[in-house]
């Protein structure tokens, strides 16, 4: 018979994708690189269902997702179209705030403690989630 493809150890399967949930923190760019080295990408949230799934696993923690406007327009790291896709910004966000005094604006998106998205300084260290297609992760 045909063998069932599974996610690697420590990864969680959901709707044909595999997810890995960090327990440490990194800046957005380092988190992005970490996922790439695992043959994955930072999580791309495409529906309420996926949003709830990730939230349930991460709990109420600031968590980087694969959405950035460092190059101007908001872009998902896997090329999913931002404009037509699912969005779950916290009210009043994104605001590209400069008042934090860290230099520059806020160019990377993360889950806030209640799951809504916020844009923040990419250098801040937050937890992160990697995602890949079933069978692709290292």
């Amino acid at each position: 018979g045909s063998e069932r493809i599974c996610c690697p150890i420590n990864w969680v399967e959901y709707e044909g994708s595999c997810y890995w949930f960090s327990s440490s923190v990194k800046p957005w760019t380092e988190a992005d690189k970490y996922c790439q080295l695992e043959n994955a990408h930072l999580v791309v949230v495409t529906s309420w269902e996926e949003q709830r799934f990730v939230q349930q696993h991460m709990g109420p923690l600031n968590t980087w997702i694969g959405l950035t406007d460092q190059n101007g327009p908001w872009k998902w790291v896997d090329g999913t179209d931002y404009e037509t896709g699912f969005k779950n910004w916290r009210p009043g966000q994104p605001d590209d705030w400069y008042g934090h005094g860290l230099g520059g604006g806020e160019d990377c998106a993360h889950f806030t403690t209640d799951g809504h998205w916020n844009d923040d300084v990419c250098r801040r260290p937050y937890r992160w989630v990697c995602e890949t297609e079933l069978g692709k992760a290292n």
């Epitope: 101007g72 908001w74 931002y82 969005k87 966000q93 605001d95 590209d96 400069y98």
Partner: antibody, heavy 113, light 107 residues
Framework: QVQLVQSGAEVKTPGASVKVSCRAS????????MHWVRQVPGQGLEWMGW????????NYTQKFQGRVTMTRDTSISTAYMELSRLRSDDTAVYYC??????WGQGTLVTVSS | DIQMTQSPSSRSASIGERVTITCRAS??????LAWIQQKPGTAPKSLIY???SLQSGVSSRFSGSGFGTDFTITISSVQREDFATYYC?????????FGHGTKVDIK
Amino acid sequence: QVQLVQSGAEVKTPGASVKVSCRASGYTFTSYNMHWVRQVPGQGLEWMGWINPNNGGSNYTQKFQGRVTMTRDTSISTAYMELSRLRSDDTAVYYCARKFGDWGQGTLVTVSS
Amino acid sequence: DIQMTQSPSSRSASIGERVTITCRASQGISNYLAWIQQKPGTAPKSLIYAASSLQSGVSSRFSGSGFGTDFTITISSVQREDFATYYCQQYNGYPFTFGHGTKVDIK
């Protein structure tokens, strides 16, 4: 494609107010702050401030504080910049701009008695 | 406020020549610097952001470099359509500020 279309040229007398509009299309209006920049004829560019279309929050440079008001109407994806107590040295082209690259065509405001 | 000083204020160049414009910030701005091109009677056009990243659709003749306080934009081989005024702009913090501009014209 992204477009920022501004209202037409205005002629005002000193002491009056002007309200310039900037209609956005081709992107999610609430996902990006709208900046306003002006250019006095023959001079360089001068940043005036921005508005966050989500909640109407704004940040104005000190030079224009008290005279400028930036607002928006999300239902029609339009940002507005109102400048009051106009003086002759406010004669300039006013531009709206989106982060890193998209600019309106400019609106010439002439202040003359 | 952060002051942005551009040099030279004007530059005459022949087609095909390499042109370099510099911009100095009065304090460190990391790489939060943009370069903007403006031709007479038209709206500004963004060329470069984050000091060295080319805006999509901009010719690879243009390149930017620098970090901290000193930045440059280079046109490797200037073409007729490149004759314009170039501004640097910092977006490290409010208020955003521009250089006074460098006019590049035909020799």
